[in-house]
Amino acid sequence: KKVVLGKKGDTVELTCNASQKKNTQFHWKNSNQIKILGIQGLFLTKGPSKLSDRADSRKSLWDQGCFSMIIKNLKIEDSDTYICEVENKKEEVELLVFGLTANSDTHLLEGQSLTLTLESPPGSSPSVKCRSPGGKNIQGGRTISVPQLERQDSGTWTCTVSQDQKTVEFKIDIVVLAFQKASSTVYKKEGEQVEFSFPLAFTLEKLTGSGELWWQAERASSSKSWITFDLKNKEVSVKRVTQDPKLQMGKKLPLHLTLPQALPQYAGSGNLTLALEAKTGKLHQEVNLVVMRATQFQENLTCEVWGPTSPKLTLSLKLENKGATVSKQAKAVWVLNPEAGMWQCLLSDSGQVLLESNIKVVPTW
């Protein structure tokens, strides 16, 4: 007996071939011997089976001795043994119909769990193997669970259902609602304008919700809310903003914030949260601001950075076109009685310059 696997809602062709390539009498029945379809003259006739309105056959192939039955909009309960009677012989085809669906909405927040449930005919014992867009393999039986969705789980999941050495493939589109980056750091010289961008890792037709940016300045004892905003159909409107700093926010996506000036008292880290309508939980993105200041006071040339820096970052003071350099893995470096000329303050990570500020030292007579 031939086994054919089908997908719920899909269309399947059950083949039945006669030895002679000519038009001949045939009919298809189910396991209860109820006629589904057959031939009468050149006409396709339908029987009393509940399948009849979804069953068809291709007349153009009858001349080739092919008397297939096509079943549209498959249901789990269509799983059965079908019998094709042609040329005084019977061909049996066992059809097994499976369905694979996500238990919840397929738009899930990062960190939430995904459960895929397999619908299968009674008596079947299928196995399921799913592959995420990032190449992660998960196996299961009637259910497959992914406990904590990650950003890279967004996309098409390919699930293979196996039964009796046959396979059928399902594709399920999962959208993980998250920001493109978990964290980002902006490096600025004191006084420069600061741009914070929070691009989303997904697109939705309608995007509605509300958000807030909480900021923990390095110099402050507690965090404070810098801005709150609403999002309606991808349009951004500010609800409340602090007086200091006076942030500005773009009206369109991606979420975009502008801090007019980078000042040492603003250096620190923030957490932007976005709550989407009809979704439990929030999207998060951490953002850090590092501010550099180079100053000369009397005989002392100083370079300082404020904000969250890693201990492996190097701060250097260097005289342009000269070898004179002072470097430290610290947040401040200084030179006493600096030579006249253009000095560079550099914040670097393994040789890569993240931030630089120039200061001119004039000769003292």
Epitope: D10, T11, V12, E13, L42, F43, D56, K72
Partner: antibody, heavy 115, light 107 residues
Amino acid sequence: QVQLQQWGAGLLKPSETLSLTCAVYGGSFSGYYWSWIRQPPGKGLEWIGEINHSGSTNYNPSLKSRVTISVDTSENQFSLKLNSVTAADTAVYYCARLVNWFDPWGQGTLVTVSS
Amino acid sequence: EIQMTQSPSSVSASVGDRVTITCRASQDISNWLAWYQQKPGKAPNLLIFAASSLQTGVPSRFSGSGSGTDFTLTISSLQPDDFATYYCQQANSFPYSFGQGTNLGIK
């Protein structure tokens, strides 16, 4: 709601190969047959050939020597190649789904063969 | 190969008229026949299949009849949206073939 979207080169020189692809969205790919039909400007419809998801093909004898229809089930797409084109192959080319009847159809692609 | 012949090649009619288009097959095709409507610059649209079955979403003013070699498409009361070209198609055997078309214009 199943939709067929087709694309390919619209301007060819004589003797070149016509190449078109049709993608199937929002519906079953297996179980159906997938056809190409053409319509010269101001004229009637001519069936070119068909393929199913397992790659079984049937072609119009008048074009069989020059036609290849292939399928990519992983992408739910099927393609048409017509070799050695001449001005007589200038037409709007349609893809369509069928069991016995053509429904639905792609939007059509005008292919012009001119030196 | 089965030849399909439509008549008339063109017909002019007014809104509200009853219009009949015929299609003849060169051999018996039982009821393996479909009718399509095509508007300029658009793909054909299935109206009738299996000679007399109305496709889902098609207005009931369209009807099909016939069997064997002679078939008819009838529009009971012509509407402004019905001015188009109509084709018949046989699905009895390869190669599938279409009639040459009937252009239905405004009188």
